[in-house]
């Protein structure tokens, strides 16, 4: 008899699963790039924007050599869950100015949720633990002003774009090591 119902199935071809995660990540990267460009057109950014509640960057040229699939997938999932929370917060608390981007933000959220489900599936197929975030969840209060929500949107989209960019490179690299 096979494994009991509900137990994680170890995939026969993890490369194919990883391929599909790469495709979704690339697709979300392109969407985020497009939305970030729209943001810049509608609300030009004056310099750089950051939010303390956003995750710190997990990958760089220096970390590529030591990447391990479990660590990358776990960290990516935790970071993307944080970005999902920030996108949801933007949609809820962003104010009238960001309402013009509501369809795009909604689509971005749906794509992000889809990628998270794909990563979760990949982790269960590889029998990896579904780790909970190790950092405390910072409650997101309402933006101080309309301009504050625009600055936050720039920071969230910029950070998400950068995270996805590195994620594609990391996942591609890990695929070659499987």
């Amino acid at each position: 008899p096979g494994p009991p119902a509900g137990s994680p199935r170890v995939s026969s071809d993890p490369r194919a699963d990883l391929d599909s995660a790469v495709l979704l990540t690339r697709s979300l990267l392109a969407d985020t790039r497009q939305l970030a460009a729209q943001m810049r057109d509608k609300f030009p950014a004056d310099g750089d924007h950051s939010l303390d509640s956003l995750p710190t960057l997990a990958m760089s040229a220096g970390t590529l050599g030591s990447l391990q699939l479990p660590g990358v997938l776990t960290r990516l999932r935790v970071d993307l869950m944080s970005y999902l929370r920030h996108v949801q917060w933007l949609r809820r608390a962003g104010g009238p100015s960001l309402k013009t981007l509501e369809p795009e933000l909604g689509a971005l959220q749906a794509r992000l949720e889809r990628l998270l489900r794909r990563l979760q599936l990949l982790m269960s197929r590889l029998a990896l633990p579904q780790a909970a975030p190790d950092q405390p969840v910072i409650p997101l209060g309402p933006p101080a002003s309309a301009w504050g929500s625009i600055r936050a949107a720039h920071a969230i989209l910029g950070g998400l774009h950068l995270t996805l960019d590195w994620a594609v490179r990391g996942l591609l690299l890990l695929k070659t090591r499987l």
């Epitope: 690339r26 990267l29 950014a45 310099g47 750089d48 924007h49 950051s50 960057l57 760089s60 040229a61 220096g62 970390t63 910029g158 950070g159 774009h161 950068l162 960019d165 590195w166 594609v168 490179r169 591609l172 690299l173 070659t176």
Partner: antibody, heavy 117, light 110 residues
Framework: EVQLLESGGGLVQPGGSLRLSCAAS????????MNWLRQAPGKGLEWVGV????????FYADFVKGRFTISRDNSKNTLYLQMNSLRAEDTAVYYC??????????WGQGTLVTVSS | QSVLTQPPSASGTPGQRVTISCSGS????????VNWYQQLPGTAPKLLIY???LLPSGVPDRFSGSKSGTSASLAISGLRSEDEADYYC???????????FGGGTKLTVL
């Protein structure tokens, strides 16, 4: 708007040293790996090296190992390239470029380094 | 000599479709993303295609990239006079632990 502005190029004698700077603005500099690339007159592009966003890791092309050093000061939003033991074949326009993953998404306008006696 | 191989020149007439090839090995193109850069005369290079076929903001969709095995190609449809430039392919090389470029292709619009 993302801007990268190189400076410090000029004429230097073989065996001499030069320090290039790249001033960054319009983005969170401390979040990005940064690179130096070069292009000899009439030739193609050549990657010199990369430094990670926090400065903890550096990788160099074989032709500059031991002679060139990349560093950064995140508090000043500035990238540096210290070039020692310069040779005639190091004559080129040097560019700094930002890396958000596998590619160079923004480049500076370049600064010319001429190594000649 | 460049690690990645590109034709030194290519040409086409306005409105035509032109393709530029780039070939490498398993340690670069085979295992890593390919990026393309455009360098207009007298200017700094500009990112044209990343992760094999993605377009950065502001790049017209007349430009497209593709990859198969250890080769990649850049296609430009509806050629315009302003496309006259040098085009470079690039990829990370696992053996060299660095970025490698093609020698560049000079595109002339006739």
């Amino acid at each position: 708007e993302v801007q990268l502005l190189e400076s410090g190029g000029g004429l230097v004698q073989p065996g001499g040293s030069l320090r290039l700077s790249c001033a960054a603005s319009g983005f969170t500099f401390s979040h990005y790996d940064m690179n130096w690339l070069r292009q000899a007159p009439g030739k193609g592009l050549e990657w010199v090296g990369v430094i990670s966003y926090d400065g903890s890791n550096k990788f160099y092309a074989d032709f500059v190992k031991g002679r060139f050093t990349i560093s950064r000061d995140n508090s000043k939003n500035t990238l540096y390239l210290q070039m020692n033991s310069l040779r005639a074949e190091d004559t080129a326009v040097y560019y700094c470029a930002r890396t958000p993953g596998s590619h160079f998404d923004y480049w500076g306008q370049g600064t010319l380094v001429t190594v000649s006696s | 000599q460049s690690v990645l191989t590109q034709p030194p020149s290519a040409s086409g007439t306005p409105g035509q479709r032109v393709t530029i090839s780039c070939s490498g090995s398993s340690s670069n193109i085979g295992n890593n993303a390919v990026n393309w850069y455009q360098q207009l005369p007298g200017t700094a290079p500009k990112l044209l295609i990343y992760y094999d076929d993605l377009l950065p903001s502001g790049v017209p969709d007349r430009f497209s990239g593709s990859k198969s095995g250890t080769s990649a190609s850049l296609a430009i449809s509806g050629l315009r006079s302003e496309d006259e430039a040098d085009y470079y392919c690039a990829a990370w090389d696992d053996s060299l632990n660095g970025v490698v470029f093609g020698g560049g292709t000079k595109l002339t619009v006739l």
